[in-house]
């Protein structure tokens, strides 16, 4: 049984205390109320690009 904070969840997933397992962050788009969604970061910003005049 995983203890939260010891072994991180795979990329794109987050620990659910309600389910005691890592859950896919993609499901948070359909159901944002899930407890593990708090640990899912937003999509990374687009690469920074300098705009020269």
């Amino acid at each position: 049984e995983r203890v939260p904070g010891t072994t991180p969840c795979p990329r794109g997933s987050s620990w659910s205390a309600d389910l005691d397992k890592c859950m896919d962050c993609a499901s948070c788009r359909a159901r944002p109320h899930s407890d593990f969604c708090l640990g899912c970061t937003a999509a990374p910003p687009a690469p920074f690009r300098l705009l020269w005049p």
Partner: antibody
């Protein structure tokens, strides 16, 4: 065969306490989330409480928060509901139910229920 | 809280009839809707999960449809053992779930 068997119901006076048990058999109990649902006489179903597979996370309906405590003993394959400060409106049949194996989207097995009557 | 409203509250039908029960959510719940059957003095029994998936062992005359706020349970040809009360349940806000008030299917 999956079975859930509730016990511990009975007649109790307002302000009293009861502890309900739900004995699970026929499946590996520890990976499953569990809930308690109640049904007042002649009424519909009301969710009461939820517990995660390890027992580390619990949730309650506002109507019972602070009075009821859900717990589980995975070594005994048993779910519990400690009910304190009971009120007349807690009178109901109490059911335990097993959550789905991938999420808690649905509840696929239910016990037969145990009747709790709160009356003086 | 999400409220679930079923209609009708009760209905009378005959064996062989096609029966439709509706369930409306107070806000969108996507497809996170389940249906249960309950007979007097018995525990609820899962029929349909995630709006349209038939639970193992449930006869194919039961079907579910819908998404968002409006859902339907259909019994294509009512059988004597189908006279019972049916409940919808939303799991969009799991583990904080809510049930509809129930629809009683009686013999005409």
């Amino acid at each position: 065969e999956v079975q859930l068997l509730e016990s511990g119901g009975g007649l109790v006076q307002p302000g009293g306490s009861l502890r309900l048990s739900c004995a699970a058999s026929g499946f590996t109990f520890s990976p499953y989330p569990m809930i308690w649902v109640r049904q007042a006489p002649g009424k519909g179903l009301e969710w009461v409480s939820y517990i995660s597979p390890s027992g580390g996370s619990t949730h309650y309906a506002d109507s019972v928060k602070g009075r009821f405590t859900i717990s589980r003993d995975n070594s005994k394959n048993t779910l519990y509901l400690q009910m304190n400060s009971l009120r007349a409106e807690d009178t109901a049949v109490y059911y335990c139910a097993r959550g789905g194996d991938t999420y808690f989207d649905y509840f696929d097995y239910w016990g037969q229920g145990t009747l709790v009557t709160v009356s003086s | 809280d999400i409220q679930m409203t079923q209609s009708p509250s009760s209905l009378s039908a005959s064996v062989g009839d096609r029966v439709t029960i509706t369930c409306r959510a107070s806000q969108s719940i996507s497809g996170y809707l389940n249906w249960y059957q309950q007979k007097p003095g018995k525990a609820p029994k899962l029929l349909i999960y995630q709006a349209s998936s038939l639970q193992s062992g449930v006869p194919s005359r039961f079907s579910g449809s819908g998404s968002g706020t409006d859902f339907t349970l259909t019994i294509s040809s009512l059988q004597p053992e189908d006279f019972a009360t049916y409940y919808c349940q939303q799991s969009y806000t799991s583990p904080f779930i809510t049930f509809g008030q129930g629809t009683k299917v009686e013999i005409k």
